[in-house]
Interface confidence: medium
């Protein structure tokens, strides 16, 4: 029985780290630069690294710029967006910025989108400074279940900030659903 | 066999209650308000309590100003950094501020530092109003290795605010790496 | 004995992942914008949803406008605040405000009110622009025992956004308390 | 109608000086970029120097430390001093508001003047 209890336990510790890490999506998604989207108006952000630098993923898939659940879980989501000016680059269009991020939750079935969190500022970028910032940080604990996809949606995405630290977005899974 | 596997299950829920919080590192430290370097420059912060009032620490070391990583795993890192100024305690050097955090990890067997999350804003603090205040929140998920170090880096350091519930950091390992 | 470690193994799945359900309380709470209080003082907000829209509890107790800790343990604790003021709405009393979230815990044992986390910025809303906005985020980790209440505080309710992807508030445990 | 128009240039011995101005009118020259650009016969136009509302300068590596760039908003005009002058600054100046862009970058730029020549003799 000695031997048996010891194939138990050892059975179960593998059985218990398995599930462990397969009950645990992640993803945190960096913004990539090179396909950045013009223009002050709002736009859906597509294009983003899964798997270079600190972006990763895992038990989730990146695709068509949406991070698709693929495991059913309370998850909690976070967002963190920076906007950047320099004198050098160019006149705003405006100084009056209303600098804006939404992260949605789309569902295949129902195809509808659905903004789960906001964050953001209105600003007045005036010329008489060669440089500006504004960063904007959300998060929140969401149910999810499979096949639901989370995008990010901003307001003058020319300002966006491309470093890697700078704008991402991401997701890990808390617990089950009851 | 029911005594056995009464056993089994005993010795099972200590094992997994405590590999689950061996499993859990985590840390949340407070600003150290003695010691908060003045001037208006980027400064890595240095002085942080972990064990007074909201701050605190487990499987996880705070040294030299940062805290150092004894356990592999994806941590959720988090960082709560508030500036403010009133009029009562001198002029600004510049109205035109930029209050930045960094978040950076250092590797020693690679000696070199990395920005894992900033955020901030450029501020105009105009000497019409009495006091200005201004907060900064980031946070996400990164794989973190037994050894690294993360640490707090800001602007103007003069002007942090010294509460343990304005300008704190912390981490929280959330699952092992696979 | 193979179908006593089949059961072992059985029993133990249901175990482990019945405590590990019971063992995570969390709750989002959002917004009740038919309730808001009017004025720019602080005050505590005592409104929120807990069962419609994003908003959801579990192994915790919303009442009274505070969210009770069921169980002891480590929890990530975060608030997402907006506000918001568009010039048909009327002029504001000010154009120089104080935007503010206090997260606060109250133990009953010790009937005193600590502010755990606080966040915000001061605003010039000059009546230049036709609309204004401004978030905060804050989030960190805590140790909060059973009993215990965490509640919200603003400046300027009357300015709240009332959408429920703009002004919530959650919590959700991570962990025991060794 | 908005109008850009240079003077001060001319002929001087190269190690010499000039100040060259451009008065803007029908634009508020407070609320652009002012620029001042240079053109060789057969070359393409190219930045020399450029005074945004924040009241930073930016040069061209060929005229830093030698040429200036001011505004003066009260008067709408923007200045360019140019010291130490060599042969090879001989070129048409131009003045020019920026619309939206890159500071350097002529392509940026919505008004522009006719032209002052500035020629400098070894």
């Known amino acids: 029985i000695r031997a048996e209890k010891a194939m138990v336990d050892g059975s179960w510790l593998d059985l218990a780290k398995r599930s462990k890490l397969e009950a645990q999506p992640f993803a945190h998604l960096t913004i990539n630069a090179t396909d950045i989207p013009s223009g002050s108006h709002k736009v859906s952000l597509s294009s983003w690294y899964h798997d270079r630098g600190w972006a990763k993923i895992s038990n989730m898939t990146f695709s068509n710029g949406k991070l698709i659940v693929n495991q059913d879980g309370f998850y909690y989501l976070y967002a963190n967006i920076c906007f950047r000016h320099h004198e050098t680059s160019g006149d705003l269009a405006t100084e009056y910025l209303q600098l804006m991020v939404y992260v949605t939750k789309t569902s295949i079935k129902i195809p509808s989108s659905h903004t789960l969190m906001k964050g953001g500022s209105t600003k007045y970028w005036s010329g008489n400074s060669e440089f500006h910032f504004y960063s904007i940080n959300v998060g929140g604990f969401f149910k999810l279940r499979s096949g639901e996809e989370i995008s990010i949606e901003v307001s003058n995405p020319s300002l966006l900030d491309p470093d890697q630290d700078a704008t991402y977005f991401g997701a890990f899974k808390v617990r089950d659903i009851d | 066999i029911r005594a056995e596997k009464a056993m089994v299950d005993g010795s099972w829920l200590d094992l997994a209650k405590r590999s689950k919080l061996e499993a859990q590192p985590f840390a949340h430290l407070t600003i150290n308000a003695t010691d908060i370097p003045s001037g208006s420059h980027k400064v890595s912060l240095s002085s942080w309590y972990h064990d007074r009032g909201w701050a605190k620490i487990s499987n996880m070391t705070f040294s030299n100003g940062k805290l150092i990583v004894n356990q592999d795993g994806f941590y959720y890192l988090y960082a709560n950094i508030c500036f403010r100024h009133h009029e009562t305690s001198g002029d600004l050097a510049t109205e035109y501020l930029q209050l930045m955090v960094y978040v950076t990890k250092t590797s020693i067997k690679i000696p070199s530092s990395h920005t894992l999350m900033k955020g901030g804003s450029t501020k105009y603090w105009s000497g019409n109003s009495e006091f200005h205040f201004y907060s900064i929140n980031v946070g996400g998920f990164f794989k973190l290795r037994s050894g690294e170090e993360i640490s707090i880096e800001v602007s103007n350091p003069s002007l942090l605010d010294p509460d343990q519930d304005a300008t704190y950091f912390g981490a929280f390992k959330v699952r092992d790496i696979d | 004995i193979r179908a006593e470690k089949a059961m072992v193994d059985g029993s133990w799945l249901d175990l482990a992942k019945r405590s590990k359900l019971e063992a995570q309380p969390f709750a989002h709470l959002t917004i009740n914008a038919t309730d808001i209080p009017s004025g720019s003082h602080k005050v505590s907000l005592s409104s929120w949803y807990h069962d419609r829209g994003w908003a959801k509890i579990s192994n915790m107790t919303f009442s009274n406008g505070k969210l009770i800790v069921n169980q002891d343990g480590f929890y990530y604790l975060y608030a997402n605040i907006c506000f918001r003021h568009h010039e048909t709405s009327g002029d504001l009393a000010t154009e120089y405000l104080q935007l503010m979230v206090y997260v606060t815990k109250t133990s009953i044992k010790i009937p005193s009110s600590h502010t755990l986390m606080k966040g915000g910025s001061t605003k010039y809303w000059s009546g230049n622009s036709e609309f204004h906005f401004y978030s905060i985020n804050v989030g960190g980790f805590f140790k909060l025992r059973s009993g215990e209440e965490i509640s919200i505080e603003v400046s300027n309710p009357s300015l709240l956004d009332p959408d429920q992807d703009a002004t919530y508030f959650g919590a959700f445990k991570v962990r025991d308390i060794d | 109608e908005v109008q850009l128009v240079e003077s001060g240039g001319g002929l001087v011995q190269a190690g010499g000086s000039l100040r060259l101005s451009c008065a803007a009118s029908?634009?508020?020259?407070?609320?652009?970029?002012m620029s001042w650009f240079r053109q060789d016969p057969g070359k393409e136009r190219e930045f020399v120097a450029a005074?945004?509302?924040?009241?930073?300068?930016y040069y061209a590596d060929p005229v830093r430390g030698r040429f200036t760039i001011s505004r003066d908003n009260a008067k709408n005009t923007v200045d360019l001093q140019m010291n130490s002058l060599k042969p090879e600054d001989t070129a048409v100046y131009y003045c020019?508001?920026?619309?939206?862009?890159?500071?350097?970058?002529?392509?940026?730029?919505?008004?522009w003047g006719q032209g002052t020549q500035v020629t400098v003799s070894s």
């Open positions: 005074v945004p509302l924040s009241g930073n300068t």
């Open positions: 029908g634009l508020t020259s407070s609320r652009y970029t």
């Open positions: 020019a508001a920026r619309a939206s862009g890159s500071i350097f970058n002529r392509g940026s730029y919505a008004y």
